[in-house]
């Protein structure tokens, strides 16, 4: 019951997180104009990953897409890529986790298969969350760098009393949405991984039986070496676990950490 609850909660938390990542990616307010030096501006600037907008005090808002690909900063491209990878992995993870849910029966799917799928989706959610957090953090770092650079030359004199105020940008709402969403996806992924351990069938506890072979007196534990060697007695063709350890075949079927680099 606790396993089902953990898995279900992990799924819901990840779902909310991925929805948040999608929302953050689409939002226009990744960076917003810093109003510290001009709190009474009649023009408010804000920028997203895909377009920049200007909201005039009249109520009119004008947004322009970044129609160039090569002309954009490499960092912005990197952030876009991280967010998209996060969304894609999260979406796949959601799809996998739906079939992995213990409360949903699909044919004669074994618990071991569901455990596999739960772990796979959990890892996908973790990587998805990390991608989102990384993307938002890279953008935030970019903002901080630009903020202090523009503060250094805030006013560029244009002769006499005339001055040009350079627009500075600060953290927009999308950054906070992204951080929270990434964190939720990460937590959901961890919960799925925890649920996976509980989903794996319990070990069948065999008592040690002594077999007296001629000339030798060796005690065997049927299936005792299965986890480490891939060999052992398993006459009923059931998977045998030794203290939660898995067969080599199973270990190979899971995505390794290198699959997501």
């Amino acid at each position: 019951m606790a396993v089902t609850a953990c898995q279900g909660l992990g799924f819901v938390v990840s779902l909310i997180g991925i929805a948040g990542i999608i929302a953050a990616t689409c939002m226009d307010q990744w960076s917003t104009q810093d109003l510290y030096n001009n709190p009474v501006t009649a023009v408010f600037n804000y920028q997203g990953l895909w377009r920049s907008c200007v909201r005039e005090s009249s109520g009119f808002t004008e947004c322009r897409g970044y129609f160039t690909l090569l002309g954009l900063p490499a960092m912005l491209q990197a952030v876009r890529a991280l967010m998209i990878v996060g969304i894609v992995l999260g979406a796949i993870g959601l799809l996998v986790s739906i079939f992995a849910l213990k409360c949903i029966r699909i044919g004669s799917m074994e618990d071991s298969a569901k455990a596999n799928m739960t772990l796979t989706s959990g890892i996908m959610f973790i990587v998805s969350g990390l991608c989102a957090i990384a993307g938002v953090s890279v953008f935030a770092n970019m903002l901080v760098t630009n903020f202090w650079m523009s503060t250094a030359n805030m006013y560029t004199g244009m002769g006499g009393m005339v001055q040009t105020v350079q627009t500075r940008y600060t953290f927009g709402a999308a950054l906070f949405v992204g951080w929270v969403a990434g964190g939720l996806t990460l937590i959901g992924g961890v919960m799925m991984c925890i649920a996976c351990r509980g989903l794996a069938p319990e070990e069948t506890n065999y008592k040690a039986v002594s077999y007296h072979a001629s000339g030798h007196s060796v005690a065997y534990k049927p299936g005792g070496f299965k986890a480490s060697t891939g060999f052992g007695s398993n006459t009923k063709n059931k998977k045998i676990y030794d203290g939660g350890a898995r067969t080599e075949d199973e270990v190979q079927s899971y995505p390794s950490k290198h699959d997501y680099v």
């Epitope: 009649a42 023009v43 009249s58 109520g59 004008e62 005339v162």
Partner: antibody, heavy 118, light 113 residues
Framework: EVQLVESGGGLVQPGGSLRLSCAAS????????MHWVRQAPGKGLEWVSY????????YYADSVKGRFTISRDNPKNSLYLQMNSLRAEDTAVYYC???????????WGQGTLVTVSS | DIVMTQSPDSLAVSLGERATINCKSS????????????LTWYQQKPGQPPKLLIY???TRESGVPDRFSGSGSGTDFTLTISSLQAEDVAVYYC?????????FGQGTKLEIK
């Protein structure tokens, strides 16, 4: 057709109060930032006050700050300017104006004359 | 506050001739977000409310004759009437619409020579 009609002007003694109204028609007031602008007889234009579409942002000219209050009644499609502690220098024609592209005041009312005199 | 200074205070031009009015702001009106200058030009005839001619320093309001044009960027702006007509006699104002308070220039009175 967009129309702005001001009312409420008149003769008032110094220190007195007056409430100007601006009735809008032909558009929904709550979609736009609105302004009051005044013009003293024979003088130039002077911006007085601004209220944002959601009434969340309000600005005043330094000359009227603390004495004038701008407000709006979106269901009535009306804009108001409550003027207290009136002075002789507040004598002017008061216009309400609606801005749009580039913050330009694209529509103006015909104005209402406020005379502050003893 | 941004100070708007117009020149000249009054201008007399012959019919069909070019009229040029200048406007200078104490701070740049160029918004880096959209590379637009937040300056507007108005025309006011006696007994009438002002009429918007130009916004974003150079964009003509719909219905405004194409003999009216705006130019300039940053702090220096110009309103040009390419061929003066009798109906163009009025007072012209420039306005800062970039930062509150939204200040107007003192006005330029345009007359026929």
């Amino acid at each position: 057709e967009v129309q702005l009609v001001e009312s409420g002007g008149g003769l008032v003694q110094p220190g007195g109060s007056l409430r100007l109204s601006c009735a809008a028609s032909g558009f929904t007031l709550n979609n736009f930032g609105m302004h009051w602008v005044r013009q003293a007889p024979g003088k130039g234009l002077e911006w007085v006050s601004y209220i944002s579409s959601g009434s969340g942002t309000i600005y005043y000219a330094d000359s009227v700050k603390g004495r004038f209050t701008i407000s709006r009644d979106n269901p009535k499609n009306s804009l108001y300017l409550q003027m207290n502690s009136l002075r002789a220098e507040d004598t002017a024609v008061y216009y309400c104006a609606r801005a749009y592209y580039g913050n330009g005041f694209s529509f103006w009312g015909q104005g209402t004359l406020v005379t502050v005199s003893s | 506050d941004i100070v708007m200074t117009q020149s000249p205070d009054s201008l007399a031009v012959s019919l069909g001739e070019r009229a040029t009015i200048n406007c200078k702001s104490s701070q740049s009106l160029l918004n880096s977000g959209n590379q637009k200058n937040y300056l507007t030009w108005y025309q006011q005839k006696p007994g009438q409310p002002p009429k918007l001619l130009i916004y974003w320093a150079s964009t003509r309001e719909s219905g405004v004759p194409d003999r009216f044009s705006g130019s300039g960027s940053g702090t220096d702006f110009t309103l040009t009437i390419s061929s003066l007509q009798a109906e163009d006699v009025a007072v012209y104002y420039c306005q800062n619409v970039y930062s509150y308070p939204l200040t107007f220039g003192q006005g330029t009175k345009l007359e026929i020579k």
